[in-house]
């Protein structure tokens, strides 16, 4: 390493760290899809940002290698809960690699949040934060899942949101 | 950018990457002051600190522009519950901005926690966390606010906080 | 500082911040011991890393004194809950110091999720999630505690984990 | 103020029905739990039960669950106490009063009580 | 079920003395720092008045000479100076569990 070379690296770094790798996303009303797939976002509006990370189809795409703590929460909610559906509720974050054909289980989160109302009738709010920090390849792909999607409330971007920073 | 003027950058970047703005509030007796105002919090004592941001009647003051990772844990508690406001709890963090004079809604939890007690005991317990990366300018200032704070159960500075670190 | 002692601190500053300290710990079938220790954690296999910091019987051990944010979260379940189990589980990050006998409490929350069993199964799930900012010298440790650690449900590492990074 | 009305003393014969009336005044109905007590005479006091007056859901001392209904008419903020199957053992006056959660859940006003009286 | 035990079961206090009730839980009343245990005072013909909330709070328009302490599983209700108006009976009452149970009482007599 040359003092021009170790120079150049500095520079680089310097112009790297003005844009550490950083994305808040947050809910739409386009969010939920009831296809199967995962959670969509706002990248722009509001409070919404991209900045070292891009986005495809509700994944945060990763341009940089490194690790990142990812985090996501999502406001749950429902009078009731629908018959049938399992007492458990699973929040994830899940990563999709080129190397890999399935999605990867990152962090998970199981809450039975419908007993919380103390009769069929009762309205009942919840909410599951996820957090923590993962290694991530450059074009390596973070997605939100929600099973089962239909209790997920969204309104104005505050309540369920998604988001990364390189650490 | 001459070799001289990065030179600058670069031990000004260094210098300012030492104080790294960071901040870890604690829940205290003062806290909750049932005024209708976002939470107080102590700033120096035990587990608290301000490392390059500052602290005005329950608001961290940002001095250096950036994206934050802000966060907020509460703990909430009762003995049953009381009837009226407060069968969802609002947990959020909030933004005072010099160009807006109201209040904006950045992170956001609704919970109903009191349908939790067991059978026959009417204790319940829950707790309920925030985070995420926001853009604040120099001057604007993040709070903290429970509704219904009386379900905000302080003891030592662990189990409430309020806290924020730009990334 | 003269420019050769500047641009020395600069090297060393790059190779540091090449590696920021970071971990994440994920649970595994021997995290839970059952002897009133803290929960023990996997450091090597699939998610789990360590990164400028070290481990030891379940404690995160400090190399490099600063501020880090540390995490914590843990899959609560059960059916039912086990006779003459406080309604209250409490879940912590707590920090042992050579210069202090005994753990000091950093971050902690107290949950009653036994109540959340839907009357038509006795099954329920719940998650706690913990994360601050902490200051933390040389040879600190930080641990992770939950009573009563048989409603733990450990399955694949993506359910219980425990993390920090320097801010 | 804070008032809690009851109904007048009963005399049933054994094997009917009752029902106890509580009109409150003077707060927000809907923002206090009712509870019911009994209290036999020459006894002590027997905490029957409690309904939420926001959707009318009850919650009963074990002991009472076979023998009472409780429900409200948010409407004219009455609370009632439905008593069935009526056995010398029900003799007693009940009273309804307002739970405050700020006071810890204590009853902190009372209706005059209602007398029951079980007598062939 | 939390038994709430009274003791003594009547006492005769001399005007302006002190009367001390006790009442015993079977198991802690406590939560964050307050004891659920709360106190009534019940005259002949009337509905019990509540006097203490939460071990040591007094309701508004009680005298100040009637004061409550306490934690735990142990409490105790002190009435000093006793006046006339306070003979009675005296009930205490656990919140924090169902059943919401209440002592045996204690009649209270001025001598």
């Known amino acids: 390493d040359g003092p021009a070379g170790s120079w150049e690296q500095l520079i680089q770094e310097r112009r790297s760290h003005e844009v550490n790798p950083a994305a808040h996303l947050t809910g739409a009303n386009s969010s939920l899809t009831g296809s199967g797939g995962p959670l969509l976002w706002e990248t722009q509006l509001g409070l919404a940002f991209l900045r070292g990370l891009s986005y495809h189809d509700g994944a945060l795409v990763v341009t940089k290698a490194g690790y990142y703590y990812i985090y996501s929460k999502v406001q749950l909610g429902g009078v009731g809960c629908p018959l049938g559906l399992a007492s458990t509720i699973t929040h994830g974050l899940y990563k999709r690699t080129p190397r890999y054909p399935e999605e990867l289980e990152l962090l998970v989160s199981q809450q039975s949040p419908c007993g919380r109302a103390t009769s069929s009738s009762r309205v009942w709010w919840d909410s599951s934060f996820l957090g923590g920090v993962v290694h991530l390849e450059a074009g390596e792909e973070v997605v939100v899942r929600v099973l089962d999607e239909r209790l997920v409330r969204l309104r104005d971007g505050t309540r369920s949101y998604f988001g990364a920073f390189m650490v | 950018d001459g070799p001289a003027g990065s030179w600058e950058q670069l031990i000004q970047e260094r210098r300012s990457h030492e104080v790294n703005p960071a901040a870890h509030l604690t829940g205290a007796n003062s806290s909750l002051t049932g005024s209708g105002g976002p939470l107080l919090w102590e700033t120096q004592l035990g587990l608290a600190f301000l490392r390059g941001l500052s602290y005005h009647d329950g608001a961290l003051v940002v001095t250096k522009a950036g994206y934050y990772y802000i966060y907020s844990k509460v703990q909430l508690g009762g003995v049953g519950c009381p009837l009226g406001l407060a069968s969802t709890i609002t947990h959020g963090l909030y933004k005072r901005t010099p160009r807006y004079p109201e209040e904006l809604e950045l992170l956001v939890s609704q919970q109903s926690p009191c349908g939790r007690a067991t059978s026959s005991s009417r204790v319940w317990w829950d707790s309920s966390f925030l985070g995420g990366v926001v853009h604040l300018e120099a001057g604007e200032e993040v709070v903290v606010r429970v509704l219904d704070e009386r379900l905000v159960r302080l003891r030592d500075g662990t189990r409430s906080y309020f806290g924020a670190f730009m990334v | 500082d003269g420019p050769a002692g500047s641009w020395e601190q600069l090297i060393q500053e790059r190779r540091s911040h090449e590696v920021n300290p970071a971990a994440h710990l994920t649970g595994a079938n021997s995290s839970l011991t059952g002897s009133g220790g803290p929960l023990l954690w996997e450091t090597q296999l699939g998610l789990a890393f360590l990164r400028g910091l070290s481990y030891h019987d379940g404690a995160l051990v400090v190399t490099k004194a600063g501020y880090y944010y540390i995490y914590s979260k843990v899959q609560l379940g059960g059916v039912g809950c086990p006779l003459g189990l406080a309604s209250t589980i409490t879940h912590g990050l707590y920090k042992r110091t050579p210069r202090y006998p005994e753990e000091l409490e950093l971050l902690v929350s107290q949950q009653s999720p036994c109540g959340r069993a839907t009357s038509s199964s006795r099954v329920w799930w719940d998650s706690s999630f913990l994360g601050g900012v902490v200051h933390l010298e040389a040879g600190e440790e930080v641990v992770v505690r939950v009573l009563d650690e048989r409603l733990v449900r450990l399955r694949d590492g993506t359910r219980s984990y425990f993390g920090a990074f320097m801010v | 103020q804070v008032q809690l009305k009851q109904s007048g003393a009963e005399l049933v014969k054994p094997g009917a029905s009752v029902r106890l009336s509580c009109k409150t005044s003077g707060y927000t109905f809907t923002n206090y739990y009712v509870y019911w007590v009994k209290q036999r005479p020459g006894q002590g006091l027997e905490w029957i039960g409690e309904?939420?007056?926001?959707?009318?859901?009850?919650n009963f001392n074990e002991k009472f669950k076979s023998k009472a209904t409780l429900t409200v008419d948010k409407s004219s903020s009455t609370a009632y106490m439905h008593l069935s199957s009526l056995t010398s053992e029900d003799s007693a006056v009940y009273y309804c009063t307002r739970s405050n959660w700020d006071y810890g859940n204590a009853m902190d006003f009372w209706g005059q009580g209602t007398s029951v009286t079980v007598s062939s | 079920d939390i038994v709430m035990t009274q003791s003594p079961a009547s006492l005769a206090v001399s005007l302006g003395q002190r009367a001390t009730i006790s009442c015993k839980a079977s198991?802690?009343?406590?939560?964050?720092?307050?004891?659920?245990m709360n106190w009534y005072q019940q005259k002949p013909g009337q509905p019990p008045k509540l006097l203490i909330y939460?071990?040591?709070h007094l309701d508004s328009g009680i005298p100040a000479r009637f004061s409550g302490s306490g934690s735990g599983t142990d409490f105790t209700l002190n009435i000093h100076p006793v006046e006339e108006e306070d003979a009675a009976t005296y009930y205490c009452?656990?919140?924090?569990?169902?059943?919401?149970?209440f002592g045996d009482g204690t009649r209270l007599e001025i001598k």
């Open positions: 309904i939420n007056p926001t959707n009318g859901d009850p």
């Open positions: 939460k071990a040591s």
């Open positions: 009452q656990q919140s924090i569990e169902d059943p919401l149970t």
């Open positions: 198991q802690s009343v406590d939560f964050d720092g307050d004891g659920y």
